[in-house]
């Protein structure tokens, strides 16, 4: 009579996380008498998965009724598979012995690989804002996927980015993997409304990739441009000097007027206007009584933006000889009542 063979027909089985895995095993003979066991791994450190004779294995069910007379099918199903269940499973026949059963023959093994979806990618930007023309880094991370093969792409404003580095860890075999990618993005003045997108494609996702986004508005600082001009006035003894603060982002702004180097008034008058590109404009103006001045006046508009070093623009207000003769006290009038700093 031919000696018993343990047949595991599938060399490998791939299962999605959360599903059940069926591991097939058949014997060619009923002899010798003795139980079968399933193990994960081989050698001394192997892990018992199922013992026909005894024990409690809540996730394991047998495909056939093992106690049925002449049964040769010892296939099992393992429920609620996780990446930690990956490995090679061996169906092993034992011969009845005393006091212990003796291992008789093992199947060739079935490798169980678990397909697990990557987590939603998380994109994070730089800790501090940078100005246009500078390069900032964005990172994208996703975890818990298997198999290791994965595709990651970066996009900005309709274009795929090419300046990025991606690592999948660990380098060797593992139950699940993580991906980390860093993209370098050169900021432009128009990036207030821009987004970077990290896209992950994996076999478990099939039709729809996973995407994570970050807004460049969190990473960019567009410094303002300043222009100080004198507006024509009806009254001969008044000058209207305006400070136009243009195209800045974010909106945090403190404006101060200096008169010949001395603080004249901290201004936050006018209305904040948002431009199409997401930057802001702001205007402040002074009404200066020219009769009050015997000499020319240098008016300086000083702007502190987003906690950065102040920038300023000056304007020399010429006082005519006629006005110098008829001087009186200076009065400054803001066209609008000042509000709190932006």
């Amino acid at each position: 009579e031919d000696e018993l063979q343990v047949i595991q027909p599938e060399k490998s089985v791939s299962v999605a996380a959360g599903e059940s895995a069926t591991l097939r095993c058949a014997m060619t003979s009923l002899i010798p008498v003795g139980p079968i066991m399933w193990f994960r791994g081989a050698g001394a450190g192997r892990e018992l998965i199922y013992n026909q004779k005894e024990g409690h294995f809540p996730r394991v069910t047998t495909v056939s009724e093992l106690t049925k007379r002449n049964n040769l099918d010892f296939s099992i199903s393992i429920s609620n598979i996780t990446p930690a269940d990956a490995g090679t499973y061996y169906c092993v026949k034992f011969r009845k012995g005393s006091p212990d059963d003796v291992e008789f023959k093992s199947g060739a093994g079935t490798e169980l690989s678990v397909r697990a979806k990557p987590s939603a990618p998380v994109v994070s930007g730089p800790a501090v804002r940078a100005t246009p023309e500078h390069t900032v880094s964005f990172t994208c991370e996703s975890h818990g996927f298997s198999p290791r093969d994965i595709t990651l792409k970066w996009f900005k404003n309709g274009n795929e980015l090419s300046d990025f580095q991606t690592n999948v860890d660990p380098a060797g075999d593992s139950v699940s993997y993580s991906i980390h990618s860093t993209a370098r993005v050169v900021l432009t003045r128009g990036d207030v409304h821009s987004q970077v997108i990290c896209e992950i494609a994996h076999i478990t996702l099939q039709g729809d990739p996973l995407r994570g986004t970050a807004n460049l508005s969190e990473a960019i600082r567009v410094p303002p441009t300043l222009e100080v001009t004198q507006q024509p006035m009806r009254a001969e003894n008044q000058a209207n000097v305006t400070c136009q603060v243009s195209n800045f982002y974010p909106r945090g702004l403190q404006l101060t007027w200096l008169e010949n180097g001395n603080v004249s008034r901290t201004e936050t008058a006018s209305t904040l206007i948002e431009n199409k590109d997401g930057t802001y404009n702001w205007m402040s103006w002074l009404l200066v009584n020219t009769c009050a001045h015997r000499d020319d006046v240098v008016l300086t508009c000083q702007v502190e933006h987003d906690g950065q070093q102040a920038v300023s623009k000056s304007y020399a207000l010429e006082i005519s000889a006629h006005q110098k003769e008829h001087g009186s006290d200076i009065t400054h009038e803001a066209a609008l009542a000042p509000t709190a700093p932006l």
């Epitope: 999605a16 997108i197 076999i203 729809d208």
Partner: antibody, heavy 120, light 107 residues
Framework: QIQLVQSGPELKKPGETVKISCKAS????????MHWVKQAPGKGLKWMGW????????TYAEDFKGRFAFFLETSASTAYLQINNVKNEDTATYFC?????????????WGQGTSVIVSS | DIQMTQSSSSFSVSLGDRVTITCKAS??????LAWYQQKPGNAPRLLIS???SLETGVPSRFSGSGSGKDYTLSITSLQTEDVATYYC?????????FGGGTKLEIK
Amino acid sequence: QIQLVQSGPELKKPGETVKISCKASGYTFTDYAMHWVKQAPGKGLKWMGWKNTETGESTYAEDFKGRFAFFLETSASTAYLQINNVKNEDTATYFCARGGYGSNYVMDYWGQGTSVIVSS
Amino acid sequence: DIQMTQSSSSFSVSLGDRVTITCKASEDIYNRLAWYQQKPGNAPRLLISGATSLETGVPSRFSGSGSGKDYTLSITSLQTEDVATYYCQQYWNSPRTFGGGTKLEIK
């Protein structure tokens, strides 16, 4: 070579159920999504949704939530579209189409289409 | 949902003509655009994916261009076998959406 072969034409009365099959060959069935597309007579193409053949998850376009269901018979590499309680407006040709993955989620291979006529 | 607009529903053309079919998305689709050709009674056939990549077996007289929201399918010299309806489709977001189609007819 890659092929998607759909079941034959169906004539149904309003209120009945229709089940269309799409048998795939020439590739690993569970590696690619399966999409379904409707084309009413003389009209354009309308995406109905897709089935993740690996996980079994279904995604339906808004207009196809409720009476429409996608099924799989993985062992037979076959996808199914079932329409319950059919209405006259379901009269159309229905296509299955394989969806790629990686950098290309395009529908690259299509079935020949199954004509469904709903008439009392 | 992303709307896909093919401005011309039909074109009357002569054999040998250069034909340009346009497709506009309601938002940026990051070049995830496909062009399909469908002849009466047949299933659609994929011509171009990724806005510009010609599929294997598609004649070189077909080409795709565009980015952002605006895309174009061009046929350099129209042949008899090119008479069909052409659909654009975005696959950047679900639901996948098709343009209304552009039917080419011979003058």
